[in-house]
Interface confidence: low
């Protein structure tokens, strides 16, 4: 075997294993960003319940702030 | 030149772009594992924020309900 | 010498299916990515897809899913293209290519 | 699918000279280009891949560069025999796509 063809031998050896590496790698990138895309769905959607509460919290304290104040002029013989 | 030295050359030529892109794909997979622990940080911080509003939302409704039943008492007795 | 040499010119009725070959010499066709690429009269490049011999894996431009069809005989050193469901626009010259040479390309015409 | 813009159809130089080819990406590609000459009646031939690195037997005075989004095929003192159609070509995801090629014009 000429030092010719053993250096392709080799190069081809090198080429398959990066093939095989770089196929690994293309897959570990593709479920990553599959995790990746799943996880900032879920990001999303706590986003939005977070909102939500966040109104909720308002509503809630604006309706206590004017019960408070109801409770206040009753007690004062107001009604 | 000879169809083996071209063949080396063709070889190389490919060679040198798989490892580029391997290279690439290994800083893509690192970016992407990065901005994916970034991502569940902010997931969990968002969890955290909700329950800490659930919490308070539960607080609050149920200050709400007992302000209600104060002034349903007070308009009994006063009005 | 390296040298890949593709099938003659081809005149075709739309409809009907042709397959192409590309012979490789110089050089073992599993050791290479063998890639497809489609060129219309006074148009560029366009990439069908490419093909590993040396296990038949398959990777398609999205274009060309369901016309293309890339095939490998690493015995007789062949790569095959077959397009299928021939029309006017499958009118133009293919070639195979491992990246770095490119066979002489088969012009393919398609006529009603 | 990304798509590689070469925004001059023609150019037209002089032997001697030096001109510059470019070709855009829509996305982020890294160095993974390749550039190719087709002469009139041929097959295309590989000049550069990687953005920047010549195939064997290439003459030097054709260059490539760029990274990311911008790349640049340079014919420094150009010759008669380089009046051809010169394309770039993104294989940093699929499909692979080619940029719509400049025709290099000698006057």
């Known amino acids: 075997v000429t030092g010719t063809q053993e250096a392709q031998e080799g190069l081809q050896g090198q080429l398959g294993a990066l093939r095989r590496e770089r196929d690994q790698l293309e897959t570990q990138t593709r479920d990553l960003e599959a995790a990746y895309n799943n996880l900032l769905r879920d990001k999303s959607a706590l986003e939005e319940e977070k909102r939500q509460l966040e109104q909720e919290n308002e509503d809630l304290a604006r309706r206590l702030e004017s019960s408070s104040e109801e409770v206040t002029r009753l007690r004062r013989g107001q009604c | 030149v000879t169809g083996t030295q071209e063949a080396q050359e063709g070889l190389q030529g490919q060679l040198g772009a798989l490892r580029r892109e391997r290279d690439q794909l290994e800083t893509q997979t690192r970016d992407l594992e990065a901005a994916y622990n970034n991502l569940l940080r902010d997931k969990s911080a968002l969890e955290e924020e909700k329950r800490q509003l659930e919490q308070e939302n539960e607080d609050l409704a149920r200050r709400l309900e007992s302000s209600s039943e104060e002034v349903t008492r007070l308009r009994r007795g006063q009005c | 010498e390296v040298q890949l040499q593709q099938s003659g010119a081809e005149l075709m009725r739309s409809g009907a299916s042709v397959k192409l070959s590309c012979t490789a010499s110089g050089f073992n066709i599993k050791d290479y990515y063998m890639h497809w690429v489609k060129q219309r009269p006074e148009q560029g490049l366009e990439w069908i897809g490419w093909i590993d011999p040396e296990n038949g894996d398959t990777e398609y431009a999205p274009k060309f899913q369901g016309k293309a069809t890339m095939t490998a005989d690493t015995s007789s050193n062949t790569a095959y293209l077959q397009l299928s469901s021939l029309t006017s626009e499958d009118t133009a010259v293919y070639y195979c290519?491992?990246?770095?040479?490119w066979g002489q390309g088969t012009l393919v015409t398609v006529s009603a | 699918d990304i798509v590689m813009t070469q925004s001059q159809k023609f150019m037209s130089t002089s032997v001697g000279d030096r001109v510059s080819v470019t070709c855009k990406a829509s996305?982020?590609?890294?160095?993974?280009v390749a550039w190719y000459q087709q002469k009139p009646g041929q097959s295309p031939k590989a000049l550069i891949y990687s953005a920047s690195y010549r195939y064997s037997g290439v003459p030097d005075r054709f260059t490539g560069s760029g990274s990311g989004t911008d790349f640049t095929l340079t014919i420094s003192n150009v010759q008669s025999e380089d009046l051809a159609e010169y394309s770039c070509?993104?294989?940093?995801?699929?499909?692979?796509?080619f940029g719509g090629g400049t025709k290099l014009e000698i006057k």
């Open positions: 996305q982020n590609v890294g160095t993974n």
């Open positions: 070509q993104q294989y940093n995801s699929y499909p692979y796509t």
């Open positions: 290519n491992p990246f770095v040479y």
